[in-house]
Amino acid sequence: EVEKTACPSGKKAREIDESLIFYKKWELEACVDAALLATQMDRVNAIPFTYEQLDVLKHKLDELYPQGYPESVIQHLGYLFLKMSPEDIRKWNVTSLETLKALLEVNKGHEMSPQVATLIDRFVKGRGQLDKDTLDTLTAFYPGYLCSLSPEELSSVPPSSIWAVRPQDLDTCDPRQLDVLYPKARLAFQNMNGSEYFVKIQSFLGGAPTEDLKALSQQNVSMDLATFMKLRTDAVLPLTVAEVQKLLGPHVEGLKAEERHRPVRDWILRQRQDDLDTLGLGLQG
């Protein structure tokens, strides 16, 4: 808390500019009008204030807007955003994607902080669903964003948004999340032809049921082992040796190296030995 002191003669700020950078904390408190600060927030970011000085500026805005900042101020917070607590952010109503982008830019290159997580939560809840533009933006800043959502939250993702998802965005998703995303992806890409469809759907196949894997095995897709190893065990078990051979194509030889790992291990144990022998890989059921 900065003590209330009178502004020294001649130091009253007429605008937010560099003249303030060598003001002491108490001078900033006494000499900068909060309403002036709010209308000239866009200037703050260009001026190299210290963290301590930013604390004072935040305190002034908090006094001016006890119920939460208006979006016109939020959009121009810049580095002052790093000073906000999740409690501060919960008071905000952020509706503009441009505002979201501006604040994510400030945190760029860093882990997702509690502040950013709260901001995103407020934004998405305000929109009612995770639309394509929002998802595009969030995954650009945080490739793991999608996989940080619960299955319930993912259920609000419209299929049209799936076009924004890149393979790396799904790297940390668990099967429960892929179970939700896969049907959406299937719907989103349904009008694509075979080979193009497989390229797009491949990252989502960890949520695919057996019947879809059987269908893919009829399309000469040549699934790589890395993708196969991420498939649901319960979806792989009913597949026949012939279906797995067609599904993997030339990659079928890779089964030998993975024979001790799920789902390959469990699948091998379900097969008849003479069927496995047709692969010529020495797999033992």
């Epitope: 001026i47 190299p48 930013l54 580095y79």
Partner: nanobody, 126 residues
Framework: QVQLVESGGGVVQPGRSLRLSCAAS????????MGWVRQAPGKGRELVAG????????YYADSVKGRFTISRDNSKNTLYLQMNSLRAEDTAVYYC???????????????????WGQGTLVTVSS
Amino acid sequence: QVQLVESGGGVVQPGRSLRLSCAASGNIFNWFYMGWVRQAPGKGRELVAGINRGANTYYYADSVKGRFTISRDNSKNTLYLQMNSLRAEDTAVYYCAVRTGDSYTSDYRRDLHDYWGQGTLVTVSS
């Protein structure tokens, strides 16, 4: 650590010119802001002119606009203040001040530190 040494002050008649220099040594490759700050007798410190590296802009106090010019010679690590048409109210101790960051990155972190010179006195008197 950063050391700043000012020179060029002195007694000058109104309407004449002076050029102040500030030689910087130490770790100033990560400067964000370099400026000239003056303190008149019995008054507070006032930023007169500054160079903002982050915004790539120059600042001048209203009272010196059109008369003072700040510049920097990177090769000599020296900051200058060219003062023309000096007035009695320009009489003050002039300090060179630098604000640096622990690391300069394009995203402009705020862990900043101030360094000051010892000051050079400028007296404008007839």
